[in-house]
């Protein structure tokens, strides 16, 4: 399930104060978020219309097909996020791959991802002043899913 | 799109050496990965059988329903990961919500997430010794998607 991609160990010095929110600047270069869409777009095929393909990546073959929209901010960690954008309001027929079935809705699956922004610290200015990381929840759509509509009570 | 969930700022002291791989121990308490599944399980209902509900969370209403399996490792950052486990080999009929349609496959959407493992540093032991973070790619299934089967060439 896992793959080692770096040297075995990175030493952790005990140099920083014990406040839980503190990070060394170097942490920002180690981005634990995706740098490309979850399902790599290995194929030249790309869905930009409401149809389910019989080949290509998973987001093209889904009956709730989606494309990935880039959301980049060089002053955020992670810099690159990808949002799944549903290409159909309803699910596509399994038979034809093109006609929509109004009995199913194609809806985004959302996830609140933690991101960090750099902000000047209160009362500190200039290049040599300390700075802050502002932690925020940022809503990202991971994929589109074909669901049965909610039953109204 | 974003929501502030912490105090405005977390001071970043410039105290740590410049080696890119170094982290303070406190970083481990700041887990930038979800501590709950992407689609919050607000309901007591959760699918453990192959059927698509008309209510409940998205993973229950999907015609490719899935459950979330917790993957916890106290020596990993993030400690908690959730894997989507598909409950059906094929997609469920939109009409009935229970009968499977062999024309569609229910497949997991995978993503290689960067994680860090805590390891004792070479030649150091005990609670006060330094430790290392080993960086790995870890495959996580985010959701299950109903797709048209691949067309065989």
């Amino acid at each position: 399930v896992s793959l080692r991609i770096q040297e075995d160990c990175s030493h952790l010095p005990r140099c920083c104060p014990s406040k839980q929110q503190e990070f060394p600047e170097e942490w920002l270069k180690w981005n634990p978020a995706p740098v490309s869409p979850p399902e790599p777009l290995r194929h030249t095929h790309h869905p930009e219309s409401c149809r389910a393909s019989k080949d290509g990546p998973l987001n093209s073959r889904a009956i709730s097909p989606w494309s990935y929209e880039l959301d980049r901010d060089l002053n955020r960690v992670p810099q690159d996020l990808y949002h799944a954008r549903c290409l159909c309001p309803h699910c596509v027929s399994l038979q034809t791959g093109s006609h929509m079935d109004p009995m199913g809705n194609s809806v985004p699956l959302y996830h609140n991802q933690t991101v960090f922004y750099r902000r000047p610290c209160h009362g500190e200015q200039g290049a040599h002043g300390r700075y802050c990381l502002e932690r925020r929840l940022y809503r990202v759509s991971l994929a589109c899913v074909c669901v049965r509509p909610r039953m109204m009570a | 799109v974003s929501l502030r969930i912490q105090e405005d700022c977390s001071h970043l002291p410039r105290c740590c050496p410049s080696k890119q791989q170094e982290f303070p121990e406190e970083w481990l308490k700041w887990n930038p990965a979800p501590v709950s599944p992407p689609e919050p399980l607000r309901h007591t209902h959760h699918p453990e059988s192959c059927r698509a509900s008309k209510d409940g969370p998205l993973n229950s209403r999907a015609i490719s329903p899935w459950s979330y399996e917790l993957d916890r490792d106290l020596n990993r950052v993030p400690q908690d990961l959730y894997h989507a486990r598909c409950l059906c080999p094929h997609c469920v009929s939109l009409q009935t919500g229970s009968h499977m349609d062999p024309m569609g496959n229910s497949v997991p959407l995978y993503h290689n997430q960067t994680v860090f493992y805590r390891r004792p540093c070479h030649g150091e032991q005990g609670a006060h010794g330094r430790y290392c973070l080993e960086r790995r790619l870890y495959r996580v299934s985010l959701a299950c998607v109903c797709v048209r089967p691949r067309m065989m060439a």
């Epitope: 869409p37 494309s67 880039l70 959301d71 901010d73 002053n75 960690v77 690159d80 750099r118 | -």
Partner: antibody
């Protein structure tokens, strides 16, 4: 008019380091990023990475990520690119370019280039 | 990494000709494609960004089109100063990558 002025040509030996500077003027430095691109003699363009001038957050190309460091100095509106452990195939013209910090990542103004020659 | 393939690798055309250069990405890049012009010994100059937007100060004879994997740069009426190398660049996924360039010569 926006200007990016780079430091002069450098000749280095294999294993040495080089630090190229890029002085920006006539725009609000912190509102943009700086990207670094190189071009080996007779070859195409190769993206090395970029830095958000306000945050200092970086992204490096995997090929050079263990040897490169990009920094900015807001007080002098200057960006720096340091490449360590130089090899002969690092011989190239190194360009800095201004880049927006958002999704549309185009390089609208470029420095004049700095020739770095690595030779024993 | 995403491969960017340009064609033709070189062309020779007369003043007033309509010139078309194509760029193909190895995978979908939506509209995250830019075009640059580079003259010998000089830095590249931005012509078109996000596939079809004309950079300020660039003559209207330059236009760009396409999305997904196939893109086109068109010079509607070639001028003597348009010689040089034209390069496409994708910015959808890091590392950003460039095409190998198309050399345009004036007949």
């Amino acid at each position: 008019q926006v200007q990016l002025v780079q430091s002069g040509a450098e000749v280095k030996k294999p294993g040495a380091s080089v630090k190229v500077s890029c002085k920006a003027s006539e725009y609000t430095f912190s509102n943009y990023g700086i990207s670094w691109v190189r071009q080996a003699p007779g070859q195409g363009l190769e993206w090395l990475g970029w830095i958000g001038a306000y945050s200092g957050f970086t992204k490096y190309a995997q090929k050079v990520q263990d040897r490169i460091t990009m920094t900015t100095d807001a007080s002098t509106t200057t960006a720096y690119m340091e490449l360590r452990n130089l090899r002969s195939d690092d011989t190239a013209v190194y360009y800095c370019a201004r880049v927006g910090t958002g999704t549309d990542s185009y390089f609208d103004f470029w420095g004049q280039g700095t020739l770095v020659t690595v030779s024993s | 990494d995403i491969q960017m393939t340009q064609s033709p690798s070189s062309l020779s055309a007369s003043v007033g000709d309509r010139v078309t250069i194509t760029c193909r990405a190895s995978q979908n890049i939506n509209s995250h494609l830019n075009w640059y012009q580079q003259k010998p010994g000089k830095a590249p100059k931005l012509l078109i960004y996000t596939a079809s937007s004309l950079q300020s100060g660039v003559p209207l004879r330059f236009s760009g089109s396409g999305s997904g994997t196939d893109f086109t740069l068109t010079i509607s009426s070639l001028q003597p100063e348009d010689f040089g190398i034209y390069i496409c660049q994708q910015t959808y996924i890091t590392p950003l990558t460039f095409g190998g360039g198309t050399k345009v010569e004036i007949k």
